[in-house]
Amino acid sequence: QGGTRSPRCDCAGDFHKKIGLFCCRGCPAGHYLKAPCTEPCGNSTCLVCPQDTFLAWENHHNSECARCQACDEQASQVALENCSAVADTRCGCKPGWFVECQVSQCVSSSPFYCQPCLDCGALHRHTRLLCSRRDTDCGTCLPGFYEHGDGCVSCPTSTLGSCPERCAAVCGWRQMF
């Protein structure tokens, strides 16, 4: 009895915080504080975040929800996950595009734009690593093509074309003079 018993809630703890005069229980994720509790250790009046707003964590003092981010169309971004009351929109790149960070020290919150993935097939090369977080990693030339400079050149179909050593090795024959 009296004040010697330890309280079930304490303003210094994580579960309850002093809001206004009282130690109040916080609002759950996805809810904002409409009015603080009006009794010791009571429940605050919490309302669900309106559409296009969110709060990701349990909170004690947020009297409004954060606005959901809009994906940057100019940077070719798309919404991978729509905004909900408890989570912001997750922006990314559509299939066939990859994230190119706009800053050198890239973290999840860094600004970015989407770049179209390299099409190894169009370059007549094998796909070594599929494009997702970074550009496609293309491998050696496809059968029927040989390395020439930076690209892959088609094996000649007649003896009229020249076939240097690398061509001969890949294409299986040497031009006769």
């Epitope: 018993r5 206004g20 009794e39």
Partner: antibody, heavy 122, light 111 residues
Framework: EVKVVESGGGLVKPGGSLKLSCAAS????????MSWVRQIPEKRLEWVAA????????YYPDSVKGRFTISRDDARNTLYLQMSSLRSEDTALYYC???????????????WGQGTSVTVSS | DILLTQSPASFAVSLGQRATISCRAS??????????IHWYQQKPGQPPKLLIY???NLESGVPARFSGSGSGTDFTLNIHPVEEEDAATYYC?????????FGSGTKLEIK
Amino acid sequence: EVKVVESGGGLVKPGGSLKLSCAASGFVFSSYDMSWVRQIPEKRLEWVAAISSGDYYTYYPDSVKGRFTISRDDARNTLYLQMSSLRSEDTALYYCARHRGGNYPQYAMDYWGQGTSVTVSS
Amino acid sequence: DILLTQSPASFAVSLGQRATISCRASKSVSTSGYNYIHWYQQKPGQPPKLLIYLTSNLESGVPARFSGSGSGTDFTLNIHPVEEEDAATYYCQHSRELPFTFGSGTKLEIK
């Protein structure tokens, strides 16, 4: 030494307005919740307003809600009570009181001023 | 609103004897492990002075002859042994919910 000193009381006609002040010293005013409590001579005490520290939430009983406004100026260490639409039943001695501190608020009032007298009469 | 009823309204006690003042709440003032009742002493021409907070905790500087007890709806302030300077009006106050309310007061006289 903790001190709270009220001022601003006086005679006012029904329907009139008055603003009470409470100057605090000897403690970190901004860290404490504060209240106004009134007392009709030889009668019971009545809590009339409270304001929290930090986030400035305000609270009133129904008897004064919409007519009285409590506020504070932490830079000036001063508590205020703006009273409007005054009635004869608002006649009383008005005390400024500090709420007892601590991590776990108890809402007991540990320091009181000497009070300022408000008379509402035509 | 929680109504606090104090009894007796007034009484006299001989010097050195025990004075017991009762405060009854119209509903429970207990929650979260605490009983939200506080006691004040008021002498003529002076503001109230906090004696006891949360039912039984003695405020700093208050003599140990003052003690408080109770839970739920029934609370008691005891003064023993009573001294001359204890002649005053005593009020209980709750802070279980809004609005905070005070008892009607008990006037103690010393015989």
